[in-house]
Interface confidence: low
């Protein structure tokens, strides 16, 4: 029998994709099919030359391309041929302006850090401005592509370039980037399809910002004289740079007066010997080179009078936040009264106080 | 309104690649979003294969960056999804989505498309 | 990464209420998640956006009787007065991002029955 589809004529431009179909005669068993080029078993290339069901898929077309391919079905019974299909691959329209680029010549000259706009609500990340000199032929590019990517070490050259079109000739606003970074930059011209040759690197170290979020899951509990607090960093994104240690800030009461403590490095726990019952209500804030950032919710826990009341009610040793702890305090003091809302409101005043004077360092 | 549409072959055989196209209408994929691919496999389990962005960035599921390639043409407003050596442990439909705000929730999603892999 | 946790399978009658949940591991109990609605042989539809301190947004014509929130490391779903069109796959997602790597899970699914 005869193929089922033959592979076509096919007229392609340079960088385009092409595919090359080819359906072999009923047989059994089933055909498989290979692919050959001017009488040559073809090469495959993953992601460039690959063959998907029967069909030849070959993306980024190159003028080598071009040539003679045909489509071979082999099963216990023997081969039959395709037809032989004519592939022509041709300079694009772009080629002349591709040629043109080829002769640009970019000086990146300049990444200034911009200062952040002004707005309500969480601070923006940071912006650059780019701006550089063309020098070459007098047809300039018709855009610009900014190429950036961020630089962990001096010798790490694994990260992907992120491209973003910029909007001017000569210099333009980039946005993107997050603070505490390292950052590569340069630019690329192109008309079209056809691209220019890269302009020069560039670094700028973006600042460290304090950390735009408090670290998560801040949890307390007790244990052998002792209240540990525990917590997660923030989330990666609000680092702003590297997260350098952790200020655990108390509230005040008659058994813990008000204080702060600095936790350096890596490490999300803090160990607060007491052995006085009371109310005990922490946060933490992640330290950046420039300071502290954004303190998390209060937590609270509350260590009983005495180990028999302990015994009596299940709800041992118990985290809260502050706007669970008068509910609580209230039912395990049987009900309203007793000065409690007065402590809870005091409580609170001094929370506003500490936390504005903290932000007041900062 | 946005409007994504899934196409590739039904069938693929053991150890081949998997290509899949995604046509958007309605919005440039080069103007903003992240332009997802998602499968669905026969248990229902949903897993997130990997984004380009509209700036060209991309990021993959680690358990498949040694063989998923994630690419776009601008010019015809589709994006790619190519998988190497695929076994029938890759038998899904293939989803392509994006979000129409916050990122990674996905608002908009193609039709899906059911890939077989099979001798 | 963060893992989310589902039940496999829940049901409720025609104009009652059910509450779906989504469990995230402890390391991201704080995390905000995603709820998608799937009924057989469509894309899953996305229907809303839980944050962890239980605020929630509805995607565009999503109906009053879908409300999210949220206790810990639990999200919610709520379906009240249910009708037969509830019945579907409910699936919540959460987006990550792991020294600079962004990336998105999804749980397994709870298949909703309406009795």
């Known amino acids: 029998e005869d193929f089922q589809i033959q592979p076509r004529d096919t007229v392609a431009v340079v960088g385009e994709s092409l595919v090359l179909e080819c359906g072999p005669p009923w047989g059994y068993p089933k055909p498989s099919v290979s692919w050959w080029k001017d009488g040559k078993p073809l090469v495959l290339q993953p992601g460039r030359r690959t063959v998907s069901g029967d069909s030849l898929m070959v993306s980024r077309a190159e003028k080598n391309d071009s040539g003679t391919y045909m489509c071979m079905a082999t099963n216990n019974a023997g081969q039959r041929e395709s037809r032989a299909a004519r592939v022509s691959i041709q300079e694009s329209q772009d080629h002349k302006e591709h040629l043109e680029l080829l002769a640009v010549r970019i000086q990146l000259e300049n990444v200034t850090l911009l200062n952040p706009e002004p707005v309500k609500g969480p601070k923006p990340g940071p912006s650059v401005w780019l701006s550089w000199k063309v020098s070459g032929p007098a047809a300039p590019a018709e855009s610009y592509t900014a190429l950036f990517r961020t630089q962990r070490s001096p010798r790490d050259q694994g990260s992907p370039w992120t491209e973003v079109l910029l909007r001017g000739l000569q210099s333009a606003k980039l946005g993107g980037l997050h603070w505490g970074q390292d950052y590569e930059f340069k630019v690329r011209p192109s008309s079209g399809r056809a691209r220019g040759p890269d302009s020069n690197v560039l670094l700028l170290r973006l600042p460290e910002q304090v950390p735009s979020a408090p670290p998560q899951g801040v949890t307390l509990r007790s244990g052998n004289g002792s209240v540990f607090v525990s917590w997660a960093p923030p989330p990666a994104e609000s680092h702003n740079g590297v997260i350098r240690g952790y200020q655990v800030w108390s509230l005040g009461n008659a058994s813990l007066p008000a204080a702060n403590w600095t936790v350096v490095g890596e490490q999300t726990q803090l160990e607060i010997a007491t052995r006085l019952p009371g109310s005990y209500c922490v946060q933490v804030a992640a330290v950046t080179g420039a300071g502290a950032g954004e303190l998390s919710t209060p937590v609270c826990l509350l260590l009983e009078q005495a180990m028999e009341q302990s015994a009596r009610d299940p709800r041992k040793h118990v985290p809260w936040t502050l706007e669970q702890l008068r509910v609580d305090l209230e039912v395990l003091f049987q009900g309203p009264g007793s000065g409690l809302n007065d402590i809870f409101e005091a409580q609170k005043i001094e929370w506003h106080e500490a936390r504005a004077h903290h932000h007041h360092h900062h | 309104q946005i409007q994504l549409q899934e196409s590739g072959p039904g069938l693929v055989k053991p150890s081949q690649s998997l290509s899949l196209t995604c046509s958007v209408t309605?919005?440039?994929?080069?103007?903003?979003?992240?332009w997802t691919w998602i499968r669905q496999f026969p248990g229902n389990n949903l897993e997130w294969m990997g984004y380009?962005?509209?700036?060209?960035?991309?990021d993959y599921n680690p358990s498949l960056t040694s063989r998923i390639s994630i690419t776009r043409d601008t010019s015809r407003n589709q994006f790619f999804l190519q998988l190497e050596s695929v076994t029938t442990q890759d038998t899904a439909t293939y989803y392509c989505?994006?979000?129409?705000?916050?990122?990674?929730?996905?608002?908009?999603w193609g039709q899906g498309t059911m890939v077989t892999v099979s001798s | 990464q963060p893992v989310l946790t589902q039940s496999p399978s829940a049901s409720a009658s025609l104009g009652a209420s059910v509450k779906l949940t989504c469990t995230l591991n402890s390391q991201f109990s704080t995390y905000n998640i995603g709820w998608y609605q799937q009924h057989r042989d469509k894309p899953p539809k996305y229907v809303m956006f839980?944050?962890?301190?239980?605020?929630?947004s509805k995607a565009d014509g999503i109906p009053d009787r879908f409300s999210g929130s949220s206790s810990g490391a639990d999200r919610y779903l709520t379906i009240s007065n249910i009708q037969a069109e509830d019945e579907a796959i409910y699936f919540c997602?959460?987006?990550?991002?792991?020294?600079?790597?962004?990336?998105?899970?999804f749980g397994s699914g709870t298949h909703f029955t309406v009795l």
């Open positions: 309605g919005y440039s994929i080069s103007s903003g979003s992240l």
């Open positions: 380009i962005s509209y700036a060209g960035g991309i």
């Open positions: 839980v944050k962890g301190d239980g605020g929630h």
């Open positions: 989505a994006t979000p129409g705000g916050y990122p990674f929730h996905f608002d908009y």
């Open positions: 997602g959460a987006d990550y991002n792991n020294a600079g790597q962004y990336g998105c899970v």
